[in-house]
Interface confidence: low
Amino acid sequence: QAGPLPKPTVWAEPGSVISWGSPVTIWCQGTLDAQEYHLDKEGSPAPWDTQNPLEPRNKAKFSIPSMTQHYAGRYRCYYHSHPDWSEDSDPLDLVMTGAYSKPILSVLPSPLVTSGESVTLLCQSQSPMDTFLLFKEGAAHPLPRLRSQHGAQLHWAEFPMGPVTSVHGGTYRCISSRSFSHYLLSRPSDPVELTVLGSLESPSPSPTRSISAAAGPEDQSLMPTGSDPQSGLRRHWE
């Protein structure tokens, strides 16, 4: 083997955001002369699991038949090609939805408003949560999330949108979670359609920019960030 072993690639199928009970496969791809693949889970001693390569020996399959809390977390893989070990892959964040009951998303004062009216999206959870995420269908990323300060557990979060224009119209959902585990999310709320009638003024910036946190004990941190497994949550709603 000339030079260092290439870093392997790790990915999940059908994706890295998996609903509770659904199957998921973690793949690790290295080189054709790999003898053994190891998968590490952050917070667990290494290796979390070990697999022999599948022919033609350049990748290994780690199967999770049914997604539970047990499997949510950050994974890296590496492989052995005698006499060396590869470096670790980039991390894979495996996120589970369905850890908590789905919240209820509503639009105040109404899901049918006139351009220029102020609108607030209200996300209510059945049990106390401290992190709420709002999604708009078709948006590349989640909108800013609300996280309560000092770990306060709340049953709701407000997403004030201010005066709306047609740009704000669309389908929204929200998800709740608890900050002690970024990898465990609630089921997504049922979708809510916001319809904005009559646009007499020039369009305002996109909702991603215009949403600001509610006043009070809430603290807004923008999404996504590179280290946050909740970034890039776009599909796999159910």
């Epitope: 509770w20 009970g21 917070g43 667990s44 850890a99 908590y100 049990s127 089921r187």
Partner: antibody, heavy 123, light 108 residues
Framework: EVQLQQSGPELVKPGASVKISCKAS????????MDWVKQSHGKSLEWIGY????????GYNQKFNSKATLTVDKSSSTAYMELHSLTSEDSAVYYC????????????????WGQGTSVTVSS | QIVLTQSPAIMSASLGERVTMTCTAS???????LHWYQQKPGSSPKLWIY???NLASGVPARFSGSGSGTSYSLTISSMEAEDAATYYC?????????FGGGTKLEIK
Amino acid sequence: EVQLQQSGPELVKPGASVKISCKASGYTFTDYNMDWVKQSHGKSLEWIGYIYPNNGGTGYNQKFNSKATLTVDKSSSTAYMELHSLTSEDSAVYYCASSPYYDYVGSYAMDYWGQGTSVTVSS
Amino acid sequence: QIVLTQSPAIMSASLGERVTMTCTASSSVSSSYLHWYQQKPGSSPKLWIYSTSNLASGVPARFSGSGSGTSYSLTISSMEAEDAATYYCHQYHRSPRTFGGGTKLEIK
């Protein structure tokens, strides 16, 4: 305070079925897995399976696949285990145990246990 | 399935004595998924140590746990009368989740 209150002792005939209940209080019932464990007299513990009350998803020890059926009633925060086709081998104490997730160690464990339900199978 | 073998099956210790019991797995178990439970006669088991070394709520600091791979242990630095009980190790690294046969700790 978290409490799991199980139903009382059962004396049943061979071939019959029995349904044991486990009523949870003091926490959000849908947040934690509910595990069921068997302990035969003077013996060790045997894991039967679990149910996730949030969506009714279950996982069983294959040994108990056709022996036990796990269900929940979210409205009353109660978990149930039905045991089928009972024989003397099924005489034991059965425990329910709720399992919170300990995120910072990436693990969950049976943290809260019911008082146990004694099932005696005898003709 | 992963078989957990506890040794000794029965042991007795004097008050103040240091006690160690072991749990050996038939194949490697991640330390995150190895727990210990305490059970006294006529009572339900109680979570005692979770994820190899974390003491459950209310467990005295004289208890500790350690280990990795296939070998784990529970230690009491100084035996007290209330520690007399049966201790079970438990894994859920692989399904089915399994328990060891237990170590019964008695007072000498």
